[in-house]
């Protein structure tokens, strides 16, 4: 964006789009101010990602004011949690992880409310929140879809998030980040499939076919690799 963005200072509660390598600009909120005393996060803001309810530390160059940027970045995207995030930033901007509601704070001096899913410490570590890997503190970055036609199939919407015929076993996600009992580990999870627009909902495999992806978003998604250390910790619907 413009250079002026790099100089922008944010305060607690500010709504932004946050950019992490390999991911689209993500709706987020400034949760903590930079503290020069903490070397690892000096000049970085702790941001809370809407939709995934995860946190990361980002510098101002990767943050973009929400109101000014929503026309540019606020378009539906196939990444898991993105549309939920767009909805939350508009309708529930004070949401906290696990349903904790925060009040907008003027400064970050006060103790934050408990956030079981957000780990303290380095920016590349997070608690085992929705979308993060099973190994606590580490992030899994999803690989870009291998085929063009796979990409289109991944954007789905409410009412078409499950398939009639499960394709492969996968551990069910738990939005509360709780440990699962052994009995529930091998839950059949559907794999989204390509579908025609306007297919009859009752037909097997009918899903919400995606609107055309924009080239800009396609390119960004290609950047995502296993080596990306920082990301909102979200997965494509493929991982359903």
């Amino acid at each position: 964006m413009s250079r002026s963005n790099r100089q922008k200072e944010y305060k607690c509660g500010d709504l932004v789009f946050a950019k992490m390598k390999g991911y689209p600009h993500w709706p987020a909120r400034i949760d903590e101010m930079p503290e020069a005393a903490v070397k690892s996060t000096a000049n970085k803001y702790q941001v809370f990602f809407f939709g995934t309810h995860e946190t990361a530390f980002l510098g101002p160059k990767d943050l973009f004011p929400y109101e000014e940027s929503k026309e540019k970045f606020g378009k539906p995207n196939k990444r898991k949690g993105f549309s939920e995030g767009l909805w939350e930033i508009e309708n529930n901007p004070t949401v906290k992880a696990s349903g904790y509601q925060s009040s907008q704070k003027k400064s970050c001096v006060e103790e934050p409310e408990p956030e079981p899913e957000a780990a303290e410490g380095d920016g590349d570590k997070k608690g085992n929140a929705e979308g993060s890997s099973d190994e606590e503190g580490k992030l899994v970055i999803d690989e870009p879809a291998k085929e063009k036609n796979e990409k289109g199939a991944l954007k789905r919407r409410a009412g078409d998030l499950l398939e009639d015929s499960p394709k492969r076993p996968k551990e069910a996600e738990n939005p509360e980040g709780e440990e699962k009992e052994a009995a529930t580990l091998e839950v059949e999870r559907p794999l989204p499939m390509e579908v025609e627009k306007n297919s009859t909902p009752s037909e097997p495999g009918s899903g919400r076919g995606p609107p055309q992806e924009e080239e800009e978003e396609e390119d960004e998604e290609e950047e995502a690799t296993k080596e990306d250390a920082e990301a909102p910790g979200i997965r494509d619907h493929e991982s359903l």
């Epitope: 549309s83 939920e84 767009l86 078409d160 998030l161 999870r189 919400r208």
Partner: antibody
């Protein structure tokens, strides 16, 4: 502030068509990701989802009612419509419309409901 | 079609009680579950979305949990204003509601 208000004919005769209108404010059905859902509730019974109209007209219907329902919209006047092609006495119910966002966020805001009575 | 079952159609509780309302899906719905409150006057409100997330303006005494096919809504400190019928709803494959649980004060 998001508000939705349903309106309809009140009483209608069996086998006649019915058109219900949902007039809303605070959002637009031309905005990517926005939809309006129609839900009904027969007296003393539970909620039943009927249909959803999305911003891009890729709509969804309850399979058991699909042949009798059609949804449409007038984005410039902030209205969504539910057409029941031929009503039956079993269609007597309170009809609600609700705003829905693209992915996982539920029927976020509801209208107050309008009663449709099918009677000869 | 995915069926949603709320086995308890009505329950009575005292003010201040902790109340849990359960809901079961006919198949794994991957946490794609919402809870709604319908007041006696017919007003319907979204309480919880995506199993456990509190909708804007909903008091924190409401919480949701569950996974796979079994889900629950908990009201931690029952207040007079909570007298209503509560519905679960899946949105993984189209949308279906549970039959509702009517909550009354003892």
């Amino acid at each position: 502030q998001i508000t939705l208000k349903q309106s309809g004919p009140g009483i209608v005769q069996p086998s006649q068509p019915v058109r219900l209108t949902c007039t809303f404010s605070g959002f637009s059905l031309s905005t990517s990701g926005i939809g309006v859902a129609w839900i009904r509730q027969p007296s003393g019974k539970g909620l039943e989802w009927l249909a959803t109209i999305w911003w891009d007209d890729d709509n969804r219907y309850n399979p058991s009612l699909k042949s009798r329902l059609a949804v449409s919209k007038d984005t410039s006047n902030n209205q969504a419509f539910l057409n029941i092609i031929t009503v039956e006495t079993a269609d007597t119910a309170i009809y609600y419309c609700a705003q829905i966002y693209d992915y996982a966020v539920g029927f976020a805001y509801w209208g107050q409901g309008t009663l449709v009575t099918v009677s000869s | 079609d995915i069926q949603m079952t709320q086995t308890t159609s009505s329950l009575s509780a005292s003010l201040g009680d902790r109340v849990t309302i359960s809901c079961r899906a006919s198949q794994d719905i991957s946490n794609y579950l919402n809870w709604y409150q319908q007041k006696p006057d017919g007003t319907v409100k979204l309480l919880i979305y995506y199993t456990s997330r509190l909708h804007s303006g909903v008091p924190s005494r409401f919480s949701g949990s569950g996974s796979g096919t079994d889900y629950s809504l908990t009201i931690s400190n029952l207040e007079p204003d909570d007298i209503a019928t509560y519905y679960c709803q899946q949105y993984g494959k189209l949308w279906t509601f549970g039959g509702g649980t009517k909550l009354e004060i003892k």
